[in-house]
């Protein structure tokens, strides 16, 4: 299709080489009458409308994204060629930063319902640059935490070093929806609830003598509880002896509850104590079996191919640890009688 009629938007993504961050493009289809797609939209390309993330369709996945190759080749369907770019409804998610993401991205409705709809498309020219030696050492992170029940704020990473007075008008989105009342470089939250969690996008306009473009940053906001003050506790095994049958395979499970920690490095290991020797056993990876805001339950199993006489004279020790401390639980095997 002819993309010359598409409205154009220029975006800049300045990414930090220190941290993992994501980026999003919204399919900002012009919808002055809030109609379905761009039906009867007679705007010329020069009359750029107020862009809003497209919310007019009942089926929000009814858009198609393309990338325009720089060498003039035909448009490429994003889904087929770019595994690190994911389409979610009307939004394009870039999972990894890098200058190779620079380029022109076009979105348009999948269903063309009238001749007027042909021009219903948006071309986004994305420039991606690594952050130069930051003039601001402590720029806000692309991953921010809000403590439940307290006050907090969400800062726009690209503007976090500017005072509120200097800051340009900022447009904020949460999970793709415009937050119309927020215009500052910081969103202040009086009391944090779990619904404040989500993907926030902040946009502001930067201009030079030639052109203007939108500077965009994405912030993943997590609502958290305070760090635990407790060492982990072992939920299983509870008993320190376990009846077993000689010659049969055996799996002993260790389940431990770890309280929330912002920097979470749980340790769960099995040791064998054989008289006065003790060594760590190579066992399958630990797995999380339940995760809530407050805590996480992690399980790790030790597997014996068959229980031997010697195993009855050993102790199997589960060791768990977080930043506060550690806990152990040992299990002695006992032969089943009769």
């Amino acid at each position: 299709f002819n993309i010359s009629g598409c409205s154009t938007k220029k975006l800049l993504w300045t990414y930090s080489t220190r941290s993992e961050e994501e980026f999003v493009l919204f399919c900002d289809l012009p919808e002055p009458q809030k109609s379905h797609f761009c039906h009867r939209n007679r705007l010329s390309p020069k009359q750029v409308p107020e862009h809003l993330p497209f919310m007019g369709s009942n089926d929000l996945s009814d858009v198609q994204w393309y990338q325009q190759p720089s060498n003039g080749d035909p448009l490429e369907d994003i889904r087929k060629s770019y595994p690190h770019i994911i389409q979610d409804k009307c939004t394009l998610h870039f999972l990894t930063p890098g200058v190779n993401n620079s380029g022109s991205y076009i979105c348009r409705p999948k269903m063309i319902k009238s001749p007027y709809d042909v021009a219903c498309c948006v071309k986004m020219i994305l420039e991606v640059k690594p952050q130069t030696n930051a003039s601001c050492e402590y720029s806000a992170s692309h991953k921010q935490d809000l403590l439940l029940g307290s006050t907090g704020s969400i800062s726009c990473p690209s503007l976090s070093c500017q005072s509120d007075a200097q800051s340009p008008a900022v447009t904020w989105y949460k999970n793709g929806k415009l937050l119309s009342v927020e215009r500052s470089n910081r969103i202040v939250v009086d009391e944090v609830y779990d619904y404040h969690q989500g993907t926030y996008v902040c946009d502001y306009t930067q201009s030079d003598t030639v052109s203007s473009w939108t500077v965009r940053a994405v912030v993943q906001v997590r609502t958290i509880v305070g760090d635990t003050k407790l060492k982990p506790d072992i939920l299983d095994p509870v008993e320190d002896t376990l009846e077993v049958e000689l010659g049969k395979p055996l799996t002993i499970s260790c389940k431990a509850r770890f309280g929330f920690e912002r920097v979470f490095n749980p340790v769960i290991k099995w040791y064998i104590k054989d008289s006065d020797l003790e060594w760590e056993v190579s066992v399958p990876e630990a797995k999380s079996i339940k995760s809530t805001l407050k805590d996480e339950i992690i399980e790790r199993n030790i597997i014996l191919e068959k229980v031997t006489q010697r195993d009855l004279r050993r102790k199997f020790v589960c060791f768990v640890q977080n930043s506060i401390g550690n806990t152990t639980q040992s299990v002695q095997l006992k032969e089943k009688r009769g």
Epitope: D274, S275, D276, R310, D311, L312, R313, R314
Partner: antibody, heavy 111, light 110 residues
């Protein structure tokens, strides 16, 4: 540490009980407490063990029947020997597997 | 019953030299590595050198090196010193029963 006691000069056919006294560690932690002997000028020979936390015992094939290992308190293990012969003459060591040995006690069987 | 066969015996080497002692088990030791090496001098109890086939016991010089798996094990003593003159024993721990001692290897340092 470990210390053996009870070594003596006895006549063939006699019985004798050796005692191993432990200090500085707890039997409840679960150790193999074993007896090993060494005849003069010969190598080490394993006799039998008791697992200190649950009392399980096991023996070398040749020692079954004549030798009995028991835990008599939270710090002592004994070796009862019956029908002794001159071939049983040896230094008897108490061994906490794998690292701790007593100095040994000498048993001499002679008429 | 398990049998541990040690070879050779005796073995002699000059100060600064290297000796290698082999230990073969009639069946695999527990976990394929539950084997220890001891040094014994006359009138003394044995002293632990190596456990779990290759782990050096605390305070033992790194000149002593253990290796092996399953049924075949080796103790190597390099940069031999006069004080290394002693009898060396391998000891295996087994899944089905208890322990077995090798017959011992006397190391003579010239």
């Amino acid at each position: 540490s470990l210390e053996e006691s009870g070594g003596d000069l006895v006549k063939p056919g006699a019985s004798l009980t050796l005692t191993c006294t432990a200090s500085g560690f707890s039997f409840s932690s679960g150790y193999d407490m074993c007896w090993v002997r060494q005849a003069p000028g010969k190598g080490l020979e394993w006799i039998g063990c008791i697992y200190s936390s649950n009392g399980l015992t096991w023996y070398a094939t040749w020692a079954k029947g004549r030798f009995t290992v028991s835990k008599t308190s939270s710090t002592t293990v004994t070796l009862q020997m019956t029908s002794l012969t001159a071939a049983d003459t040896a230094s008897y060591f108490c061994w906490r597997v794998w690292s701790l040995w007593g100095p040994g006690t000498l048993v001499t069987v002679s008429s | 019953a398990q049998v541990l066969t040690q070879t050779p015996s005796p073995v002699s080497a000059a100060v600064g030299g290297t000796v290698t002692i082999n230990c073969q088990s009639s069946q695999s030791v527990a976990d394929n590595n539950l084997l220890a090496w001891y040094q014994q001098k006359p009138g003394q109890p044995p002293k632990l050198l190596i456990y779990k086939a290759s782990t050096l016991a605390s305070g033992v010089p790194s000149r002593f090196k253990g290796s092996g798996y399953g049924t075949q094990f080796t103790l190597t003593i390099s940069d031999l010193e006069c004080d290394d003159a002693a009898t060396y024993y391998c000891v295996g721990g087994y899944s089905t029963s208890g322990y077995a001692f090798g017959g011992g290897t006397e190391v003579v340092v010239k």
